[in-house]
């Protein structure tokens, strides 16, 4: 029977800068029941606080709701593991909410084959930003990436769309059924999951771009 091993805070994420969650990995339990607590203080403070919500984020997590989340202050946090034989602490972790944003996937993905008479046909892809993200404040710049492939193909073709919410693709294989997905990333944060796939049938008379 031993004191617990050193825990590690290995992930913090925020969907929108208004709330966030951090997760830790327990060290060895020393063969005894072990209690974990996350404590934190904010920059410029010495007063330590305990995690406000151990439930919402699931096991070994701490969730900071709206009233506990500030974009203006860095959080300095650590996890304490305690059993009957002693305690151990994780390394301190500095968390700036701006740098942990991982948005939900973009919404309303629409895909359409356009065949103008005077120009080459193309695939037109359009989407909307995730609802939780407020782009009007200027705090967020969202970048988008599209991936598509014929239904039976193994490899995805990836296109970076920058900040635009629509995109044209010219080079496609006629007669194939394509899967299309989109994801987004704030300029300082993490890529979202890919949106659910949208399927589109490319007509057989679709002319490949040279």
């Amino acid at each position: 029977q031993l004191p617990p091993g050193k825990p590690e805070i290995f992930k913090c994420r925020s969907p929108n800068k208004e709330t966030f969650t951090c997760w830790w990995r327990p060290g060895t339990d020393g063969g005894l029941p072990t209690n974990y607590s996350l404590t934190y203080h904010r920059e410029g403070e010495t007063l330590m606080h305990e995690c406000p919500d151990y439930i919402t984020g699931g096991p070994n997590s701490c969730h900071f709701g709206k009233q506990y989340t500030s974009m203006w202050r860095t959080y300095i946090m650590m996890v304490n593991a305690t059993n009957q034989m002693g305690s151990s602490f994780s390394d301190e972790l500095y968390v700036d909410v701006t740098y942990i944003v991982q948005p939900d996937p973009p919404l309303e993905l629409a895909v359409e084959v356009k065949q103008p008479e005077d120009r080459k046909p193309y695939l037109w892809i359009k989407w909307s930003p995730p609802t939780l993200i407020d782009l009007k404040t200027g705090w967020f710049t969202l970048l988008y990436e599209i991936r598509l492939k014929p239904e039976k193909a193994a490899e995805w073709e990836i296109h970076f769309a920058g900040q635009q919410t629509e995109f044209k693709i010219l080079s496609l294989h006629p007669g194939q059924k394509y899967l299309v997905q989109v994801r987004c990333k704030p300029d300082h944060g993490y890529w979202s999951a890919w949106s659910p796939a949208t399927f589109i049938q490319i007509p057989s008379d679709f002319t490949m771009n040279d």
């Epitope: 974009m71 500095y94 700036d96």
Partner: antibody
Framework: QVQLVQSGAEVKKPGSSVKVSCKAS????????MHWVRQAPGQGLEWMGV????????NYNQKFKGRVTITADESTSTAYMELSSLRSEDTAVYYC???????????WGQGTLVTVSS | DIVMTQTPLSLSVTPGQPASISCRSS???????????LHWYLQKPGQSPQLLIY???NRFSGVPDRFSGSGSGTDFTLKISRVEAEDVGVYYC?????????FGGGTKVEIK
Amino acid sequence: QVQLVQSGAEVKKPGSSVKVSCKASGYTFTSFWMHWVRQAPGQGLEWMGVIDPSDTYTNYNQKFKGRVTITADESTSTAYMELSSLRSEDTAVYYCARGDYSNWFTYWGQGTLVTVSS
Amino acid sequence: DIVMTQTPLSLSVTPGQPASISCRSSQRLVHSNGNTYLHWYLQKPGQSPQLLIYKVSNRFSGVPDRFSGSGSGTDFTLKISRVEAEDVGVYYCSQSTHVPWTFGGGTKVEIK
């Protein structure tokens, strides 16, 4: 404890490439972005770029765009910085550096001296 | 790119005496999120740089309270209230509000 251990010193010819490695330990490698910073002899520090090892997203200083490539190998918890078309002005100590969930550098490698000389 | 200008280039200080280093940026360093990402690093002889102060005025963990940072907009200052022998090295200011992140040219602090 967090450690960043870099590869050894290199001597390279002008026009060639160099690849410096940075092996991370003491934390989950894919959890934090890894930056590269260089320091020419007797000079200041210069940020080169960054990688998110969880999905290999990179962002480079435009000054090095096209010459620098930052990669990461999750299986060995190692980040790499490759600089091509070397010139004498690239003679410098190259550092890998990790932040927390922040935009300052909390941990630094010991540095790798790259000398470019004919 | 944001240019960070440090003054003086070097400082020779008697132990126990104060020291002050100035850093001026070519543009305001207020991020769109309201934070000012101006930091100070110390590079001791033969070592890698180490973080002293983050976001203008916050001492990093383990940094003695004789170090303090202040400033806003484009003008920032690092002060050492009583210089000790272990404080020798080159001090760098750094901004990470705008990409590419940039550093000042450094201020070398020596003991008299």
